[in-house]
């Protein structure tokens, strides 16, 4: 399955929008920094086949979408930027979904790497618990925004590697 060119453009747009969403200086939140232990090995395109990598990407974007779709998120960000960001993620989900469905239909496709899906889920669990622990403070959201920019960058790079594999 070939992801459309618009997909990588959407990915870049999402990153730009997330960058614009910052409301406070990251320097004022240095004491709130946290290592969420991004599962970098799950973004190593050489580690698994394309079908599996796309499932991991889908999980990553889906969890990001869910994280920014909460009431707490709505209260934290400027509404129009948040809506645009969510729209970009939603479009990416649709592209990835179509690819995963296509791969599911191919009988010889190896089973999804369930531990990779779980690693992504655990990563977002750490982020969720951090926000709860910090009572969804502006600095906590700023730290999370910066972290999600990192993870979206990893996603973008993985997609580039997948396209090169083609």
């Amino acid at each position: 399955c070939d992801l459309p060119q618009t997909h990588s453009l959407g990915n870049r747009r999402a990153l730009i929008l997330l960058g614009q969403m910052g409301r406070i200086s990251p320097f004022s939140c240095l004491k709130d920094r946290h290592d969420f232990r991004i599962p970098q090995e799950e973004f190593d395109g050489n580690q698994f086949q394309k079908a599996q990598a796309i499932s991991v990407l889908h999980e990553m974007i889906q969890q990001t979408f869910n994280l920014f779709s909460t009431e707490d998120s709505s209260a934290a960000w400027e509404q129009s930027l948040l809506e645009k960001f969510s729209t970009e993620l939603y479009q990416q989900l649709n592209d990835l979904e179509a690819c995963v469905i296509q791969e599911v239909g191919v009988e010889e496709t190896p089973l999804m790497n369930e531990d990779s899906i779980l690693a992504v889920r655990k990563y977002f669990q750490r982020i969720t618990l951090y926000l709860i622990e910090r009572k969804y403070s502006p600095c906590a959201w700023e730290v999370v925004r910066a972290e999600i920019m990192r993870s979206l960058s990893f996603s973008t790079n993985l997609q580039k590697r997948l396209r090169r594999k083609d």
Epitope: N66, E97, V104, E114, D115, L118, Q125, T128, L129
Partner: antibody, heavy 119, light 108 residues
């Protein structure tokens, strides 16, 4: 509010199959994995597996791979679990439960369907 | 798979008594992925405690959770009649996800 609706009971004959349903409402169905859990009378809970309604990918507990098949119908926002070659060991209450994170993990359960396997 | 062993299987407590239920894991479980559910007869389980020590919405403050590694517990500081139920621990630290066999807590 989030709701997962399951039929109350199913009576099936040994060797037959049954398809259980779990109709979701109150949230975007495709955004969360749906899980299935088995509970035999007076016993503990067993995780059967999960399905992502967005694309249909499944992850199973090895113990149930040859017993259960998970599917979804996005148009009717319903998750299904087919149980095959039923025996008395399959007589149990089967719950669907929605995934999530933090305080949303298995925060929403269906009422459960009691499956009775009897001749 | 990670086997969760709960003890005792059944226990009864008087109103006002302190109660501790334990959950022992066959191998180490990260505390972020250890949950507790309450279930009353004829009902589906209810999320009670998430990530070892966080109370779910609506759970009375007399409940608390603690633990790490292979040893976890749920404590009720002062037993009340409405606390009579079965309690299950659950882990999603690794596949397949597992539940404990449960502790049935009765009121004396």
């Amino acid at each position: 509010q989030v709701q997962l609706q399951q039929p109350g009971a199913e009576l099936v004959k040994p060797g037959a199959s049954v398809k259980l349903s779990c109709k979701a409402s109150g949230y975007t169905f495709t955004n969360y994995w749906m899980h299935w859990v088995k509970q035999r009378p007076g016993q503990g809970l067993e995780w059967i597996g999960e399905i992502n309604p967005s694309h249909g990918r499944t992850i199973y507990n090895e113990n149930f791979k040859s017993k259960a098949t998970l599917t979804v119908d996005k148009s009717s926002i319903t998750a299904f679990m087919q149980l095959s070659s039923l025996t008395s060991e399959d007589s149990a209450v089967y719950f669907c439960a929605r995934g999530g994170l933090g305080p949303a993990w298995f925060a929403y359960w269906g009422q459960g369907t009691l499956v009775t396997v009897s001749a | 798979q990670i086997v969760l062993t709960q003890s005792p299987a059944i226990m009864s407590a008087s109103p006002g008594e302190k109660v501790t239920l334990t959950c022992s894991a066959g191998s180490s479980v990260d505390s972020s992925y250890l949950y507790w559910y309450q279930q009353k007869p004829g009902s589906s389980p209810k999320l009670w405690i998430y990530s070892t020590s966080n109370l779910a919405s609506g759970v009375p403050a007399r409940f608390s959770g603690s633990g790490s590694g292979t040893s976890y517990s749920l404590t009720i500081s002062s037993m009340e009649a409405e606390d009579a139920a079965s309690y299950f621990c659950h882990q999603w630290s690794s596949y397949p996800f597992t539940f404990g066999s449960g502790t049935k807590l009765e009121i004396k």
